[in-house]
Interface confidence: low
């Protein structure tokens, strides 16, 4: 099943977030991703656990799924590179980097993200664009067309009490709160944008959605820029 | 280079289904869009619509909606379309077509089949 | 879906002349985010498959002879062909594919 959705959001203007990547299985959207470069696409390392043998290829310059799209292509993958440190039992370093086949043609629908390299966080009640295909209602509607939602950060401290997520937010990753506005498992790999610059990756671990004390957790790609310049060097 | 073979001529009765197929070489077949176009013996083009070989999804010109179905066999690099409860109007040629690397025109295609439908 | 109006249905040129052909939409194909007028030209000699000529309403496939020209933007297109040869002979076709694909219904070019 794929991985994600956006609850309590509403439909993206079309190809307003040219940076936006669906990852796809067999076809079938898996994950959502970011076009950090123009042969690269972000994800998340955890989507690839249900790829197993079958094709994984990146559509980009999409708003509907199925709908024909001037813009539209979908690509090959050439190279994924999931972070070395990922493990399929924890949410830590849950980044996937994925080498298309070719450079993406780059126009108003397809265009790289730039994403943040200071490593300090976000400050704590900052709206934040977070987006996706993943399904919009607990009953599994999967919405065609791209679904976001803004989403205010959560201090680490809020997000890691003992009713939260107790403690598991280490300072490479960022919370969002989720008070019926959400993202969740399967928007996974997808942006967490604030201010135009690509802060986090929404990350792909099991949790219960729209829950205000389960907020999102999302990977901050600052914390991890040496790797993602050493893998795209 | 990219090329789409299409089959045979096809002599069928009236009320009868046909299948005719499009066997891709030259490029990585689920990585495009496979179109069809039907040309009236005289006239012009239509688009009848496309399937996607990766996840088998399909699109229809509404007005064939009924008439076809469109598949696709991987592992062979072939599309196929099936037209069903054949009647005179559906006597044509029928051409499969790619678009080009990056956007949606149609830069190769198929040699046609011709399809008679003859009591 | 956009409709593609094509005239004349034909005409018939002695080699060596100039010939334009019209092409209009029942809507704009101009997408406004790059510009571009999302237009189609095809060749179809008897017998033959239809062959890409011009796409961008305006830019030669590559191989197709510099006397073939497309003009025109949101509605109203022209194919020109500068000096016609025997080889030209064939029907002409413009084709839309901002919203689905729909084509002209062509004009045939004949050769006095």
């Known amino acids: 099943p794929p991985r994600g959705r956006i609850l309590g959001g509403r439909e993206a203007e079309a190809h307003a977030r040219p940076y936006m990547a669906s990852v796809q299985l067999n076809g079938a959207h898996l994950c959502g991703g970011v076009l950090v470069a123009e042969q690269w696409v972000l994800s998340a390392a955890h989507c690839l656990e249900d790829a197993a043998d079958g094709k994984v290829q990146v559509l980009l310059g999409a708003h509907s799924l199925s709908q024909p799209e001037p813009s539209k292509r979908l690509y090959d993958v050439l190279r994924a590179v999931p972070h070395p440190d990922s493990q399929p039992d924890t949410i830590d370093h849950d980044l996937l980097l994925l080498q298309l086949s070719e450079k993406a043609t780059l126009g108003p629908a397809v265009r790289p993200l730039p994403w943040q390299r200071v490593d300090r966080d976000v400050a704590p009640g900052t709206l934040c664009d977070v987006a996706g295909w993943g399904i919009v209602n607990h009953a599994g509607r999967r919405p065609d067309s791209l679904q976001h939602v803004l989403l205010p950060v959560l201090d680490r401290a809020t997000c890691n009490r003992r009713t939260h997520h107790d403690g598991a937010i280490t300072e490479r990753l960022m919370c969002a709160e989720s008070n019926r506005r959400d993202s969740c498992k399967g928007d996974s790999g997808g942006p967490l944008v604030c201010g135009g610059v690509l802060e986090g990756v929404v990350t792909s671990g099991s949790r219960v959605c729209g829950n205000r004390k389960k907020p999102g957790i999302y990977t901050r790609v600052a914390s991890y820029a040496a790797w993602i310049d050493s893998v795209l060097a | 280079q990219v090329q789409l073979q299409q089959s045979a001529a096809e002599l069928a009765r009236p009320g009868a289904s046909v299948k005719m197929s499009c066997k891709a070489s030259?490029?990585?077949?689920?990585?495009?869009?496979v179109h069809w176009v039907k040309q009236r013996p005289g006239q012009g083009l239509e688009w009848i619509g496309y399937?996607?070989?990766?996840?088998?999804?399909?699109d229809y010109n509404q007005k064939f909606k009924d008439k076809t179905t469109l598949t696709a066999d991987i592992s062979s690099s072939t599309a196929y379309i099936q037209l069903s409860s054949l009647t005179s109007e559906d006597s044509a040629v029928y051409y499969c077509?790619?678009?080009?690397?990056?956007?949606?025109?149609?830069?190769?295609w198929g040699q046609g089949t011709l399809v008679t439908v003859s009591a | 879906n956009i409709m593609m109006t094509q005239s004349p249905s034909s005409l018939a040129v002695s080699a060596g002349e100039k010939v334009t052909m019209s092409c209009k939409s029942s809507?704009?194909?101009?997408?406004?985010?790059?510009?571009?007028?999302?237009l189609a030209w095809y060749q179809q000699k008897p017998g033959q498959s239809p062959q890409l000529l011009i796409y961008?309403?305006?830019t030669r496939e590559s191989g197709v002879p510099e006397r073939f020209t497309g003009s025109g933007s949101g509605t109203d297109f022209t194919l020109t062909i500068s000096s016609v040869q025997a080889e030209d002979l064939a029907v002409y076709y413009c084709?839309?594919?901002?919203?689905?694909?729909?084509f002209g219904g062509g004009t045939k070019l004949e050769i006095k």
């Open positions: 077509a790619r678009r080009g690397v990056n956007w949606s025109w149609f830069a190769y």
């Open positions: 030259g490029y990585t077949f689920t990585s495009y869009t």
């Open positions: 399937i996607n070989p990766s996840s088998g999804f399909t």
């Open positions: 809507q704009s194909v101009l997408y406004s985010s790059n510009q571009k007028n999302y």
């Open positions: 961008w309403a305006s």
């Open positions: 084709h839309q594919y901002l919203s689905s694909w729909t």
